[in-house]
Interface confidence: low
């Protein structure tokens, strides 16, 4: 369905409000350092232009592609060279190279100040004074810090953000109403950003086939009553949506996502019995609801997989004639029968099956060769099961904070070259798997835990890619998407690492730690723990525990002291000396 003017087409499909919001997100995700006012000006100019094209699709420049229009607009920014350095060179290129160039300069860890939440009254005043600007600023601040945030989903977050302020700014106790809602949005937003980052990494680093395999497995678990052809259609459409969003084509992405939600709801009888409630909601809520919908019940009469994929004499014939479709069917059939497996485990099983067929279909007796292929699955299934069992036991024994500390020590010893802030952030997130997944029954633990770990380890991979410091991290991140977690799990202490020089400044603390929130105080202590391990990678758990207990007691004591700063200075010196003695530094 070719349109004379793509910009007019998208403006009409999405409506002015969503059009403006999506263009703002796109621009903020590309030019992450630009001031808010500059972006608003660019968005308004694009919107006015779009309106002229709606009025007359034959008007000048209306036939240009969105990449051309948006790229031309971004390249008008006066301070591009000073602010972005070599990114300015993108503007010398033609489309589609120019857009690719902008994409390559997206920064997963931009040097931006931490978002500080103002007082509730200040926020409510700002909301009432200019609601539109207030909400645009939210989109801008999230988009520039999360350059791969799933744009149509960010519109859903903004809708909830607006609803929270609308309700709470007229409540008797504004803070009690608003702050929990904002905390929830922040935590959900970080999780949503990380999940989408994995989808984009999957598409960009491992290709469409890898993403489609992931989607076949996940959708087959979610919609086990849907036929293979139906799942294939959904996978094709979903791949298009995510390819567009990850490629910066946010208008097309949002439009296609809406179409996909519409299709799913119109055909829910042949997809899933769980979609009814979702499909009664407005568009943004509907799409979000479908993406999070629980797995449908498995059909009762599913035959054994062995008949088609092992016992049949035609396995190699079928495989040779349509490799990807045959493997897709295998994955579909296995996944719909195993909602208790993680997606990455299902993909490992499919890879093992593929490797076996590649080998056996060239053998003298193929059937004899692949007859025992399902036996090869057993150790692959047991490995994550055992790992989750052990770690959930450890989590239940230690609680979240100490479980995070155990992981901090474990991962710092594996990859000590990685920056301390990255190790702290990633290990804290790895540790959250306990609270998130260990409460679930056995049948839900693995999909919860291992697929969450894939998301967190991808954070490590994208942060490490920006400034690579460890060959081991690079190896685990690039060799196989589905084996990242087993690769990191298998890493032992890095014996080649030369311990970091001791620096007393790293372990010098001040009274400001006393005014920090519990979370911030934990991060300070965990930062110190990582530094300790970097100085003394061979320190035992017992040694590290003793030093950390002393450190906690020191902070508690000095925060209760009358002269806090003096206490931190004097007691801090004693603590450093005692720690050096305890660890033999």
């Amino acid at each position: 369905d070719a349109h004379k003017s793509e910009v007019a087409h998208r403006f009409k499909d999405l409506g002015e409000e969503n059009f403006k919001a999506l263009v703002l997100i796109a621009f903020a995700q590309y030019l992450q350092q630009c001031p808010f006012e500059d972006h608003v000006k660019l968005v308004n100019e694009v919107t006015e232009f779009a309106k002229t094209c709606v009025a007359d699709e034959s008007a000048e420049n209306c036939d240009k592609s969105l990449h051309t229009l948006f790229g031309d607009k971004l390249c008008t920014v006066a301070t591009l060279r000073e602010t972005y350095g070599e990114m300015a060179d993108c503007c010398a290129k033609q489309e589609p190279e120019r857009n690719e160039c902008f994409l390559q300069h997206k920064d997963d860890n931009p040097n931006l100040p931490r978002l500080v939440r103002p007082e509730v009254d200040v926020m409510c005043t700002a909301f009432h004074d200019n609601e539109e600007t207030f909400l645009k600023k939210y989109l801008y601040e999230i988009a520039r810090r999360h350059p791969y945030f799933y744009a149509p989903e960010l519109l859903f977050f903004a809708k909830r953000y607006k609803a929270a302020f609308t309700e709470c700014c007229q409540a008797a106790d504004k803070a009690a109403c608003l702050l929990p809602k904002l905390d929830e949005l922040r935590d959900e937003g970080k999780a949503s950003s990380a999940k989408q980052r994995l989808k984009c990494a999957s598409l960009q680093k491992f290709g469409e086939r890898a993403f489609k395999a992931w989607a076949v497995a996940r959708l087959s678990q979610r919609f086990p009553k849907a036929e293979f052809a139906e799942v294939s259609k959904l996978v094709t459409d979903l791949t298009k949506v995510h390819t567009e969003c990850c490629h910066g084509d946010l208008l097309e992405c949002a439009d296609d996502r809406a179409d996909l939600a519409k299709y799913i709801c119109e055909n829910q009888d042949s997809i899933s019995s769980k979609l009814k409630e979702c499909c009664e909601k407005p568009l943004l809520e509907k799409s979000h609801c479908i993406a999070e919908v629980e797995n449908d019940e498995m059909p009762a009469d599913l035959p054994s997989l062995a008949a088609d994929f092992v016992e049949s004499k035609d396995v190699c014939k079928n495989y040779a004639e349509a490799k990807d479709v045959f493997l897709g069917m295998f994955l579909y059939e296995y996944a719909r029968r195993h909602p208790d497996y993680s997606v990455v485990l299902l993909l490992r099983l499919a890879k093992t099956y593929e490797t076996t067929l590649e080998k056996c279909c060239a053998a003298a007796d193929p059937h004899e060769c692949y007859a025992k292929v399902f036996d090869e699955f057993k150790p692959l299934v047991e490995e994550p099961q055992n790992l989750i069992k052990q770690n959930c036991e450890l989590f239940e024994q230690l609680g979240e904070y100490k479980f995070q500390n155990a992981l901090l020590v474990r991962y710092t010893k594996k990859v000590p070259q990685v920056s301390t802030p990255t190790l702290v952030e990633v290990s804290r997130n790895l540790g959250k798997v306990g609270s998130k997944c260990c409460k679930h029954p056995e049948a839900k633990r693995m999909p919860c835990a291992e697929d969450y770990l894939s998301v967190v380890l991808n954070q490590l991979c994208v942060l490490h890619e920006k400034t690579p410091v460890s060959d081991r991290v690079t190896k685990c991140c690039t060799e196989s998407l589905v084996n990242r977690r087993p690769c990191f799990s298998a890493l032992e202490v890095d014996e080649t690492y030369v311990p970091k020089e001791f620096n007393a400044e790293t372990f010098t603390f001040h009274a400001d730690i006393c005014t920090l929130s519990e979370k911030e105080r934990q991060i300070k202590k965990q930062t110190a723990l990582v530094e300790l391990v970097k100085h003394k990678p061979k320190a035992t758990k017992e040694q590290l525990k003793a030093v950390m207990d002393d450190f906690a007691a020191f902070v508690e004591k000095c925060c209760k002291a009358d002269d806090k700063e003096t206490c931190f200075a004097e007691e801090g010196k004693k603590l450093v000396a005692a720690s050096q003695a305890a660890l033999g530094l």
């Epitope: 004639e321 479709v325 045959f326």
Partner: nanobody
Framework: QVQLVESGGGLVQPGGSLRLSCAAS????????MSWVRQAPGKGPEWVSA????????RYAETVKGRFTISRDNAKKTLYLQMNSLKPEDTAVYYC????????GSQGTQVTVSS
């Protein structure tokens, strides 16, 4: 996306004939072996017949041998099943599949053999 749409089913008397068609799209039909599968009420899926990608090699379940003929037209991306001498036990939903799978990839077409 992979799509298979069957047609040609209906109500027929014992001893009668029907010709089923399966229109394929979303994949390179000419590169794939295809099958017909059927599912009778309250029973599991039963493989009926298969044909290789070129149309030279055909196979049949014992229950239909000599009565059913599978064929294909790669130019039209269509699979056929000519069913003669139909019996009441042939009553089922018939659907086509890629390769030799008994997994339903489509809605199928109902065949009812009854006097």
């Amino acid at each position: 996306q992979v799509q298979l749409v069957e047609s040609g089913g209906g109500l027929v008397q014992p001893g009668g004939s029907l010709r089923l068609s399966c229109a394929a799209s979303g994949f390179s039909f000419g590169s794939f072996g295809m099958s017909w599968v059927r599912q009778a009420p309250g029973k599991g899926p039963e493989w009926v017949s298969a044909i290789d990608s070129g149309g030279a090699d055909t196979r049949y379940a014992e229950t239909v041998k000599g009565r059913f003929t599978i064929s294909r037209d790669n130019a039209k991306k269509t699979l056929y099943l000519q069913m003669n001498s139909l019996k009441p036990e042939d009553t089922a939903v018939y659907y086509c599949t890629i390769g030799r799978s008994t997994t339903r990839g489509s809605q199928g077409t109902q065949v009812t053999v009854s006097s």
